[in-house]
């Protein structure tokens, strides 16, 4: 699987999850998030050669098409597969609120 | 929606579904598919600016991150959202077989 266990331990050029730390205030301008200051959102990148973690029959077909027609602009793209939530603390006035934001952390990638 | 109805009628530079005809024999080397000879598989391409048909909170965050950090390599990617099946005819020896291949035709895209 193209997950953090594999991708963070290997120098993988092809589609894999990459570490990306986002600081809410500095990177997004979100001053309203009090905790955490930032988090590892991660991201997916790298080429998607034929059959590499193909998401659907279409991505398999497109991968093969791209292999046999290298000049073609059509190819699968490396995108998030499994995502995890992130719990944040913020304030509404003087009242603290805790919320779980879904699909915030990329744990693995796929070719789609 | 970034679907064929919209994308095929507009000159859209950003993420959209694009027409792509694939000939099974010529483009994939699949001699075993007897009908159809080929089909419009289509594909997704184009930049994913902030908030454009964002698939998850992560793609929204990544889009904003990319907007505020233009030098960053991390950005959402334009990939298939809705896919449709394709019915094909092939032969096993002298016996004809009809099969519905799932997720073969891209009908719309998203930024993921």
């Amino acid at each position: 699987a193209l997950d953090t266990n594999y991708c963070f331990r290997n120098l993988e050029e092809n589609c894999c999850v990459r570490p990306l730390y986002i600081d809410f205030r500095q990177d997004l301008g979100w001053k309203w998030v009090h905790e955490p200051k930032g988090y590892y959102a991660n991201f997916c990148s790298g080429p998607c050669p034929y059959l590499r973690s193909a998401d659907t029959t279409h991505s398999t077909v497109l991968g093969l098409y791209n292999t046999l027609n290298p000049e073609a602009s059509a190819s699968p793209c490396c995108v998030p597969q499994d995502l995890e939530p992130l719990t944040i603390l913020y304030y509404v006035g003087r009242t603290p609120k805790v919320e779980q934001l879904s699909n915030m952390v990329v744990k693995s990638c796929k070719c789609s | 929606a970034l679907d064929t109805n919209y994308c095929f009628r507009n000159l859209e530079e950003n993420c959209c579904v694009r027409p792509l005809y694939i000939d099974f024999r010529q483009d994939l080397g699949w001699k075993w598919v007897h009908e159809p000879k080929g089909y419009y598989a289509n594909f997704c391409s184009g930049p994913c600016p902030y908030l454009r048909s964002a698939d998850t909170t992560h793609s929204t965050v990544l889009g904003l991150y990319n907007t505020l950090n233009p030098e960053a390599s991390a950005s959402p990617c334009c990939v298939p959202q809705d896919l449709e099946p394709l019915t094909i005819l092939y032969y096993v020896g002298r016996t004809p077989k009809v099969e519905q291949l799932s997720n073969m035709v891209v009908k719309s895209c998203k930024c993921s």
């Epitope: - | 001699k31 007897h34 019915t87 005819l89 032969y91 020896g93 002298r94 016996t95 004809p96 009809v98």
Partner: antibody, heavy 119, light 111 residues
Framework: EVQLLESGGGLVQPGGSLRLSCAAS????????MSWVRQAPGKGLELVAD??????????YYSDSVKDRFTISRDDSKSTVYLQMNSLRAEDTAVYYC??????????WGQGTLVTVSS | DIQLTQSPSSLSASVGDRVTITCRAS??????????MHWYQHKPGKQPKLLIY???NLASGIPSRFSGSGSGTDFTLTISSLQPEDFATYYC?????????FGGGTKVEIK
């Protein structure tokens, strides 16, 4: 260009044997089923014998009229299909065509070879 | 085995005529939307030639005056304007199941 060249036809006495050969070129012989179709004088086309590719275990078919007397075989290394005809009868007199069916239709045909069974 | 019955068994026509030949199968030769019926032309001393495959698809190099239609058990070969070189015997053939069989043929003669 697809070419199918039959050979081996001729005059033979009832009860005798003949071996027809069909040398193929111009296509991926290994991938496709090959057939022998005959036309007896004044009659229509009849599929006599058929052999599919190695992918499908060289499965064979014979019409009832030739079963247990004719044997179809193929040599993929030589791109050749054969029809061994034993215990020949007068009613086997016909032009025998070698043909290839990539799908459900017989797309290409040889010129045919005449087999005459007569005393 | 699936039997194919062609009609008529022979016909006389003139150059320029529209000719229709039918082929009826003893059971359906269609599967899903695919119609597994094919048509051939056979002239004396020559090998048969594929005209139409899967009911309505024109084979490579065949003139557009030939067309095919039908589904299920009933199929038609049409020659829109008969030409001198079209006088021949025409056969249908199915590939719905093994064994594939041919129709008895339709001989098109000069009137």
């Amino acid at each position: 260009e697809v070419q199918l060249l039959e050979s081996g036809g001729g005059l033979v006495q009832p009860g005798g044997s003949l071996r027809l050969s069909c040398a193929a070129s111009g296509f991926d012989f290994n991938s496709y089923g090959m057939s022998w179709v005959r036309q007896a004088p004044g009659k229509g086309l009849e599929l006599v014998a058929d052999i599919v590719s190695k992918t499908y275990n060289y499965t064979t078919y014979y019409s009832d009229s030739v079963k247990d007397r004719f044997t179809i075989s193929r040599d993929d290394s030589k791109s050749t299909v054969y029809l061994q005809m034993n215990s020949l009868r007068a009613e086997d007199t016909a032009v025998y065509y070698c043909t290839v069916a990539p799908g459900g239709s017989f797309d290409y045909w040889g010129q045919g070879t005449l087999v005459t069974v007569s005393s | 085995d699936i039997q194919l019955t062609q009609s008529p068994s022979s016909l006389s026509a003139s150059v320029g005529d529209r000719v229709t030949i039918t082929c009826r199968a003893s059971q359906s030769v269609s599967i899903s939307r695919f119609n597994l019926m094919h048509w051939y032309q056979h002239k004396p001393g020559k090998q048969p030639k594929l005209l139409i495959y899967r009911a309505s698809n024109l084979a490579s190099g065949i003139p557009s005056r030939f067309s095919g239609s039908g589904s299920g058990t009933d199929f038609t070969l049409t020659i829109s304007s008969l030409q001198p070189e079209d006088f021949a015997t025409y056969y249908c053939q199915h590939s719905r199941e093994s064994p594939w069989t041919f129709g008895g043929g339709t001989k098109v003669e000069i009137k």
